[in-house]
């Protein structure tokens, strides 16, 4: 790091060391030899989240509905407003400045991992033995019936889209 | 009371490196930055750099900067001032020095040192 | 870096003198000032900090004064315990600088 001419929470102006505004806070006037550094706190729907030396504050982030979104965390003088998206949607970058609606799993896909307000769907092709055959969001695969189980016999075989058909055996007389 | 009590004299060969303890006590060490000084044989006084205790933050003079590291061990109140590549003109009594509180200072750097470590002779010599 | 530069580099005095030391600063620094005594083979002292506020437990006989580029650190009656070498510092900004040192002898 190179060498800094000021404390920590401080800033060089003039060749004078003055402190800097915390958090929540911006700069009216620059401190001398006399005074100290002035600063006012941020007024409605703004924040300044650092120390710093800024003369305006950020606005708060607008969580546009028409975008699919709403607000998940509100903001304060010293933080943002934290945007989500609305059930069904995710957001389309970190920044969340938009929402897309999740998307389904086709028949044949079952769902590996529920989408959230930040991640989107994730699917997985149905292995052998498991089949979907819906479109959903929300459906994993499931596993062919067990014909067996219920002393009947495969009559038609499953694919990743259909479960098995299962019927009665055949009785020797 | 205040007391900052430093490590022992040391004897180095140019080139190695040397490693120079302060420990803390009487205060709160997390709350005053702690600033390191030499003063070599008949000579005035050098300021290397300074620590902040509670962040770990350093500021090193760019005479030092590349061979002085500044660290500290909050657990134990103790800060350390190792330089490395000694040479001849390195041989000098190293303080360190407490500053005034974190929060204190408004403008300027308003550091005045009021509580010294009774200093460590370091010789470098071949 | 702001320069610090102290006169006089020595001085001799007698017991009840009044003696004056001068530090001046290569640019103006406000009243980011100190003084500090050291005897030999001893840590500095701190006297003055702020230009011109005495340290507690200094004696009264120590003042200091002057702002922006020219400071005075004055001894009003000295005393045999006041021999020494003094430094100025800047604290305006890093990096700290001292002065070279004014040596204080008996007459």
């Known amino acids: 790091e190179p060498p800094t001419a000021c404390r920590e929470k401080q800033y060089l102006i003039n060749s004078q060391c003055c402190s800097l505004c915390q958090p929540g806070q911006k700069l009216v006037s620059d401190c001398t030899e006399f005074t100290e550094t002035e600063c006012l706190p941020c007024g409605e729907s703004e924040f300044l989240d650092t120390w710093n030396r800024e003369t305006h504050c950020h606005q708060h982030k607008y969580c546009d509905p028409n975008l699919g979104l709403r607000v998940q965390q509100k903001g304060t003088s010293e933080t943002d407003t934290i945007c989500t998206c609305e059930e069904g949607w995710h957001c389309t970058s970190e920044a969340c400045e938009s929402c897309v609606l999740h998307r389904s799993c086709s028949p044949g896909f079952g769902v590996k991992q529920i989408a959230t307000g930040v991640s989107d769907t994730i699917c997985e092709p149905c292995p052998v033995g498991f089949f979907s055959n819906v479109s959903s969001a929300f459906e994993k695969c499931h596993p062919w019936t067990s014909c067996e189980t219920k002393d009947l016999v495969v009559q038609q075989a499953g694919t990743n889209k259909t479960d098995v058909v299962c019927g009665p055996q055949d009785r020797l007389r | 009371q205040v007391q900052l009590v430093q490590s022992g004299a040391e004897v180095k060969k140019p080139g190695a490196s040397v490693k120079v303890s302060c420990k803390a006590s009487?205060?709160?060490?997390?709350?005053?930055?702690m600033h390191w000084v030499r003063q070599a044989p008949g000579q005035g006084l050098e300021w290397m750099g300074w620590i902040n205790p509670d962040s770990g933050g350093t500021n090193y003079a760019q005479k030092f900067q590349g061979r002085v590291t500044m660290t500290r061990d909050t657990s134990i109140s103790t800060a350390y001032m190792e330089l490395n590549r000694l040479r001849s003109d390195d041989t000098a009594v190293y303080y360190c020095?407490?500053?005034?509180?974190?929060?204190?200072?408004?403008?300027?750097?308003?550091?005045?040192?009021?509580?010294w470590g009774q200093g460590t002779l370091v010789t470098v010599s071949s | 870096d702001i320069q610090m530069t102290q006169s006089p580099s020595s001085v001799s005095a007698s017991i009840g003198d009044r003696v004056t030391v001068t530090c001046r600063a290569s640019?103006?620094?406000?009243?980011?000032v100190a003084w500090y005594q050291q005897k030999p083979g001893k840590v500095p002292k701190l006297l003055i900090y702020s230009a011109s506020k005495i340290q507690s437990g200094v004696p009264s006989r120590f003042s200091g004064s002057g702002s922006g580029t020219d400071f005075t650190l004055t001894i009003s009656s000295l005393q045999p315990e006041d021999f020494a070498t003094y430094y100025c510092?800047?604290?305006?900004?890093?990096?700290?600088?001292f002065g070279q040192g004014t040596l204080l002898e008996i007459k």
């Open positions: 640019q103006a620094i406000g009243s980011w």
């Open positions: 020095a407490r500053d005034q509180p974190l929060g204190y200072c408004t403008n300027g750097v308003c550091s005045y040192f009021d509580y």
């Open positions: 009487g205060y709160t060490f997390t709350g005053y930055y």
């Open positions: 510092q800047q604290a305006n900004s890093f990096p700290i600088t």
